[in-house]
Structure formats: C-alpha cells, structure tokens
Interface confidence: medium
C-alpha cells in the first residue's frame, strides 16, 4: 500500500484552492475539537484504475470519488482525510486534502477525486473519506467508508499490471486432468518460456468434504528451451483410499521473477456419480525415497509413482 510515486498530487479545481498532503491518519481536529463541523460526504464511488509509475510500470490504483451534501455546513469544510486500510494486514495509508480557500455553493454539486493509492491484486481495502474538521466526541459522524476488493491476476485488466506479470500472470497452463482409471490421473499443461522447474501438488478429498485425505507432490525439472510453450504430461498414481475420490491438481511454477510466490493454477476432478469400490493396487512404487542415486521427483505422502513427458 503506497502512493503513486511521481505524480504531482492536485486537488484544486475551479472555485477552490486545494493542496494534498501526507497524513499521519490522526488529524489535529481529533485532539482539538471544533464547535462547528461539516456533514459527511454524500456518496463515495470507488473503482479500479491502472496507472504507470515513473519507471514505466503499470500498477493498479484505487480511483476514489465523492460528492458533498448541499447543506450550509460546507462553509465549515476545511478539507478531507482519505484513508485506505488493507484489511488482511491492518496497514493504513492516509492523505489530507487541505482547502486553502472557502467553499461556496455553486450551480453544480462539489465533486472530488483521488487516484494515487497503489494497491495489490486480490486484496480487500476499506476506503474512508473523513471531512475535516472531525466531529466533537459525541457529534454526528462526518465520514463515509466503503470496502473494495481488488480483483486477482486472473482478471483481464489486472493481468497486464507489473505485479501480476511478475508473479506469472501471462502464463496460461491450460491444465487438463483426465482420470485414466481408478488409480491414475493424467495431467497435461503448457510450459512457459522459461527454464524453471514446476511442482504439482495433488490433493484428494472425500466426496462432499473439505479435509484432505491424501496429498502427493511431484517435481518437474526445468524444461529445455526447445520445450518452451509445449505441452507436458504427468501421470500421477492415486492412493487406494476409501472414498478419497475428488482430486485437485495445483501447478506451481518457480519463475525467476516470483520464485516461491508465483501464481498457482488449479484444476479439479469430481468424484464419479456412483463411486465403485476401487480394486487393490497390484504393485506400488515404494513409499521410501530412493536408496541410491536420485530421482527427478519426490513424493510427499504416498506410494504413487509418477512420470512425465514433454510433447513438441
């Protein structure tokens, strides 16, 4: 949560001299209350915009817009405090609009905008516009708040932003998962144009339940340049566990721009309509790690053998 770096923060408009200042989120009027205070904003509108930084990066920003009520209290309006709170971290950022001239009624309703709060994909924010001075302790509140959920990197508009591109948003693995038989899943996906490894996490669940009954991790080594953009397939051996029939496959890439924090893509296979009791697996790969040498995968908690191929 930060302010867009290079923009001159402007809030002046015809009939009003105004300056934007950084704020500690604790306006002086909290400490020294005034007798006469303005009413609250009439409406707050928030939407997502994409702006470029001075380094040419595209970043998601909140576009905040609000209007004033048409009452006489605007004569006592000295400015506004804009606060953005990131809900999952409690991080808060504030700016203050300081009016350098008195507001007067004019033929149109007063409208203010601010588009400089840089936000993160897939995060929820609470945006508050507080008119200044703030009310006396028992006075009517003169602020309005609204929550806004920033879309995740799957969203078309977000996909092209720098934070999303850094986390691998342009990679579309187009995962397909096919049940070969009661014991095997085939996973196909498209490799990206980078020589980096991938990890496939298979998580299985009982029908209609959300606690996992089985997990298996499969490692895919970095493809060679001639394999970029090609389809890769992996056959995962399932655990012969009763009712453990709904399978979620998650692919995690390790691109250089995001390392352990790259966007993961998932696909799910539902339980069959009438699940038959699976036959015992006749022959397993061992639970143990290989005793000598090394394999190109390690399994998490299963006896599942798995192998992969790249298709040109």
């Amino acid at each position: 949560l930060r302010l867009l770096d290079h923009r001159a923060l402007v809030c002046s408009q015809p009939g009003l001299n105004c300056t934007v200042k950084n704020s500690t989120c604790l306006d002086d009027s909290w400490i020294h209350p005034r007798n006469l205070t303005p009413s609250s904003p009439k409406n707050i509108y928030i939407n997502l915009s994409v702006s470029s930084t001075q380094h040419g990066e595209l970043v998601p920003v909140l576009h905040v817009e609000w209007t004033l009520q048409t009452d006489a209290s605007i004569l006592y309006l000295e400015g506004a405090e804009l606060s953005v709170l990131q809900l999952n971290t409690n991080e808060r950022l504030c700016v203050r609009f300081e009016f350098l001239s008195k507001l007067r009624h004019h033929h149109r309703r007063w409208r203010f905008t601010f588009s400089h709060f840089v936000v993160d994909p897939d995060q929820e924010y609470e945006v508050t516009v507080h008119h200044l001075p703030k009310p006396i302790p028992d006075g009517d509140p003169n602020h309005q708040s609204k929550n806004f959920l920033v879309p995740d990197c799957e969203h078309a508009r977000m996909k092209v932003t720098t934070p999303c591109m850094s986390s691998g948003s342009l990679w579309d693995p187009n995962i397909t998962v096919e049940t070969l038989d009661t014991q095997h899943l085939r996973v196909d996906f498209t490799l990206w144009n980078e020589s980096t490894h991938y990890q496939i996490l298979l998580t299985s669940f009982p029908h209609m339940e959300n606690h996992s009954c089985f997990e298996h991790m499969h490692h895919i080594p970095a493809p060679r340049p001639e394999e970029f953009h090609q389809r890769s397939n992996v056959t995962l051996t399932l655990r012969n566990l009763k009712g453990c029939c709904r399978h979620q496959v998650q692919i995690q890439p390790f691109f250089s721009s995001c390392l352990n924090d790259c966007l993961r893509h998932s696909a799910t296979v539902s339980c069959p309509e009438m699940p038959d009791t699976p036959e015992p697996i006749p022959d397993y790969m061992p639970l143990w790690e290989p005793r000598s040498g090394s394999s190109d995968y390690k399994d998490d908690d299963d006896k599942g053998s798995s192998h992969h191929h790249h298709h040109h």
Partner: antibody, heavy 116, light 107 residues
C-alpha cells in the same frame, strides 16, 4: 540423515494448554507431511492427526476436534501440535512422525503430564 | 472407524524360534497396512509397509503377508533384540488406526 527432534517434557494442570514442537532436519521439510501420534502410559498408539507442510491442510482425529491445532513454520522446518483444555487422560507421550499415512521417521517423543 | 485387533496379546518365544503375529481389520484395508516395533522408552520403529514391503534397514527375518482383513507378521528366527511390542496400523481409511499391540517376550 533424517531427524525429528521434539521439545522437552511438560507438566500441566487440567484445563491448561500445551504446545509441543517437532524440528525436522535432513530432508526438504515441505515435501512430506507431519503426523502426530500419542501413547498413554502402558497403552497403545493413538493417531491424533496430520498437517501438510506444503499446503497447511489438516486432518484431525474426531475425538480431538476442537481441542487440537497443528501448525508448521516452514522457515524453521518445525511442526507444532497444540492441545487445549487438557484432562488427566491426555497424559501421554506425544510423537511427531513424518508422512501422512504411513510413518517412516519418528521423533523421540514428548511426555506431557496433566495433573492437579 | 476401522478397528484393528492383534493376537495374541502376549507371545512367549524362545530365541531362534519362529514368531507369528496376527492382525485383523474390522473391514477390508486392501494392502494398506504397516507394522511397527517398539521397545520400552523408545519411539516406534517402522518394519513393514504396504502389508509386505520391508522398510529400509529392516533385517530379512521380518516378513509381512496378507491383504483385505487378515495380516501376519513373521519373525523367522527370533534374536534377543527382537523382544518388544509390535503394532499394526491401517492407512486405508480415516481415521488411521492401530492395533492394541502384541508383546513378544522371552520364553
């Protein structure tokens, strides 16, 4: 070599909580889940639950649901098991073990005594 | 839940003799069964998994057999270090369950 080293013995009063740690070494922590098994004095083994060190998914024994919480700290390759509202019949040796279904490596055990 | 029943509770055997331990499941567990050995004051040690596969470092005198509901752990020639308690465990269905144990003692 693979090692699971558990925290030391604890004496708790009924109603209190205990948190046992299990530090893994000798392998990639997030490749294998951690299970917890306990053994009351002179009794057999009882499965308590499991946590995925990769996804954080958990699966707890029904009888402990609501009282037990399993967590991991991947930065230190440590798994934790917290048991709340302790009763005298929770007195046991608590073991962490590697893997979800079948346990190939075990910690040395942590004796938790619940007594007023 | 699947109940695992081990028999006998105690088995008295002389060193060098064969020991046969039994484990029965209340319903089929396929081949998803493990055997562990535990000595006093120690953590369990894995012996057999998938009903018949020996764990790393386990001597050949230990063997497992069976599938479905009936399983057997056989120690072909008991050594002094084999006197311990043996547990079976199913991992075919949640919750995972252990048998009550068989104590193998010196006759």
């Amino acid at each position: 070599q693979v090692q699971l080293v558990q925290s030391g013995a604890e004496v708790k009063k009924p109603g209190a909580s205990v948190k046992v740690s299990c530090k893994a070494s000798g392998y990639t922590f997030t490749r294998y889940g951690i299970s917890w098994v306990r053994q009351a004095p002179g009794q057999g083994l009882e499965w308590m639950g499991w946590i995925s060190t990769y996804s954080g998914n958990t699966n707890y024994a029904q009888k402990l649901q609501g009282r037990v919480t399993m967590t991991t700290d991947t930065s230190t390759s440590t798994a934790y098991m917290e048991l709340r509202s302790l009763r005298s019949d929770d007195t046991a040796v608590y073991y962490c073990a590697r893997r979800q279904l079948y346990f190939d490596y075990w910690g040395q055990g942590t004796l938790v005594t619940v007594s007023s | 839940e699947i109940v695992m029943t081990q028999s006998p509770a105690t088995l008295s055997v002389s060193p060098g003799e064969r020991a046969t331990l039994s484990c029965r499941a209340s319903q089929s567990v396929s081949s998803n069964l493990a055997w562990f050995q535990q000595k006093p004051g120690q953590a369990p040690r894995p012996l057999i998994y998938d009903a018949s596969t020996r764990a790393t470092g386990v001597p050949a005198r230990f063997s497992g057999s069976g599938s479905g509901t009936d399983f057997t752990l056989t120690i072909s020639s008991l050594q002094s270090e084999d006197f311990a308690v043996y547990y079976c465990q199913q991992y075919d269905n949640w919750p995972l369950t252990f048998g009550g144990g068989t104590k193998v003692e010196i006759k």
